[in-house]
């Protein structure tokens, strides 16, 4: 019962986490215009992974997609890749874990197969969560670096030289959604891995096996005969998977009182 609960809870937590990762990836508020200590503007800028937006105090919002791949910063491309890898792994993990759920009967699937699938999905959720957390953290680091660079520019006496207002960006809502979602997916994955241990049959004891001799009837009761569990030579079923280290080579602006009425 506890195993089923752990597995079910792990699935639900991971599902919420992956939904959050998808939401964060699609959100436009990865970075938002810093309003603190800035002249109060009637225009608010915010940016996502796929487009940048401007919301005017009039209520008019205009968003423009990044219609170039080559012209984008490598870091942004890396964040995009990490988030997409996280979503893909998470989605596959969800698919696998549905079939692995103990409460769902599919044909004559053995518990051992379900244990395998539970561990697979658990590992996928863990990697998915780590990808999301890494992606969001890389973006946050990029923001912090740019923030202090733009702050330095504001105070280096370049006033008259600069033709645009130095817009500083700070953490947007998507970052917090991404961190929380990544954490949930990670926790869900760990729970699935824990559930896997309970699902895997340790041993089967044949307490009484009757042997009928041709002559007289003798009941033979061996002490603890261990039968094979269907995992080939792996009778103890201690290690179904090795960790499966993965290498991912492809991974490389209503309002507040200031934002306009």
């Amino acid at each position: 019962m506890a195993v089923t609960a752990c597995q079910g809870l792990g699935f639900v937590v991971s599902l919420i986490g992956i939904a959050g990762i998808i939401a964060a990836t699609c959100m436009d508020q990865w970075s938002t215009q810093d309003l603190y200590n800035n002249p109060v503007t009637a225009v608010f800028n915010y940016q996502g992974l796929w487009r940048s937006c401007v919301r005017e105090s009039s209520g008019f919002t205009e968003c423009r997609g990044y219609f170039t791949l080559l012209g984008l910063p490598a870091m942004l491309q890396a964040v995009r890749a990490l988030m997409i890898v996280g979503i893909v792994l998470g989605a596959i993990g969800l698919l696998v874990s549905i079939f692995a759920l103990k409460c769902i009967r599919i044909g004559s699937m053995e518990d051992s197969a379900k244990a395998n699938m539970t561990l697979t999905s658990g590992i996928m959720f863990i990697v998915s969560g780590l990808c999301a957390i890494a992606g969001v953290s890389v973006f946050a680091n990029m923001l912090v670096t740019n923030f202090w660079m733009s702050t330095a520019n504001m105070y280096t006496g370049m006033g008259g030289m600069v033709q645009t207002v130095q817009t500083r960006y700070t953490f947007g809502a998507a970052l917090f959604v991404g961190w929380v979602a990544g954490g949930l997916t990670l926790i869900g994955g760990v729970m699935m891995c824990i559930a896997c241990r309970g699902l895997a049959p340790e041993e089967t004891n044949y307490k009484a096996v009757s042997y009928h001799a041709s002559g007289h009837s003798v009941a033979y009761k061996p002490g603890g005969f261990k039968a094979s569990t269907g995992f080939g030579s792996n009778t103890k079923n201690k290690k179904i998977y090795d960790g499966g280290a993965r290498t991912e080579d492809e991974v490389q602006s209503y309002p507040s009182k200031h934002d306009y009425v």
């Epitope: 215009q33 002249p39 109060v40 503007t41 009637a42 225009v43 800028n45 940016q47 940048s52 937006c53 401007v54 005017e56 105090s57 009039s58 209520g59 008019f60 205009e62 423009r64 600069v162 033709q163 645009t164 207002v165 817009t167 602006s253 209503y254 309002p255 009182k257 306009y260 009425v261």
Partner: antibody, heavy 118, light 113 residues
Framework: QVQLVQSGAEVKKPGSSVKVSCKPS????????IDWVRQAPGQGLEWMGG????????VYNEKFQGRVTLTADKSSMTAYMELSSLRSEDTAVYYC???????????WGQGTLVTVSS | DIVMTQSPDSLAVSLGERATINCKSS????????????LTWYQQKPGQPPKLLIY???TRESGVPDRFSGSGSGKDFTLTISSLQAEDVAVYYC?????????FGGGTKVEIK
Amino acid sequence: QVQLVQSGAEVKKPGSSVKVSCKPSGYTFTNYLIDWVRQAPGQGLEWMGGINPGSGDTVYNEKFQGRVTLTADKSSMTAYMELSSLRSEDTAVYYCARRVRGNSFDSWGQGTLVTVSS
Amino acid sequence: DIVMTQSPDSLAVSLGERATINCKSSQSLLNSGNQKNYLTWYQQKPGQPPKLLIYWASTRESGVPDRFSGSGSGKDFTLTISSLQAEDVAVYYCQNNYFYPLTFGGGTKVEIK
């Protein structure tokens, strides 16, 4: 078509208050901000503040902070501007205007002349 | 506050001739987010409220004749009337729509020579 109809002219004593109304029509009242701009006789335009009729959020020109109060009544679909502690230099034509894209004002009321005189 | 300085204060131009009004802002009105300049031009005739001519420094409001055009970026802006008509006699104002408080220029009076 979009129209903003303002209340009639007012004559006030120094130290008193005036409340000017602005009733827009031809569009959804809560969808656009209403700004207030004044123009002293023979002078230029001066922005006083703006209100979001949907949320009631306001932004004011600090020059008028404390003296001006902008409100909006959704039921009567009317915006109001109240200016207190009137002085002779507050004598002006007061306009309400609808804020649109570019934060520009595309439709204006006909203006309300407020005369402050003892 | 952002100071908007218009020049000249008044301008006399012959009918059919070009009229040019300048507006200078004390700070850049160019928003880096959408590369738009938050400057608006209005026309005000005696006894009337102002009329919106141009927003985003160069976008003509619908119904405004194409002889009116806006240009400039950052701090320096220009309103041009390519061929002055009698009905264009008015006072023209520029407005900062980027920083609060939203401020207007002092106005430029356009007359017929």
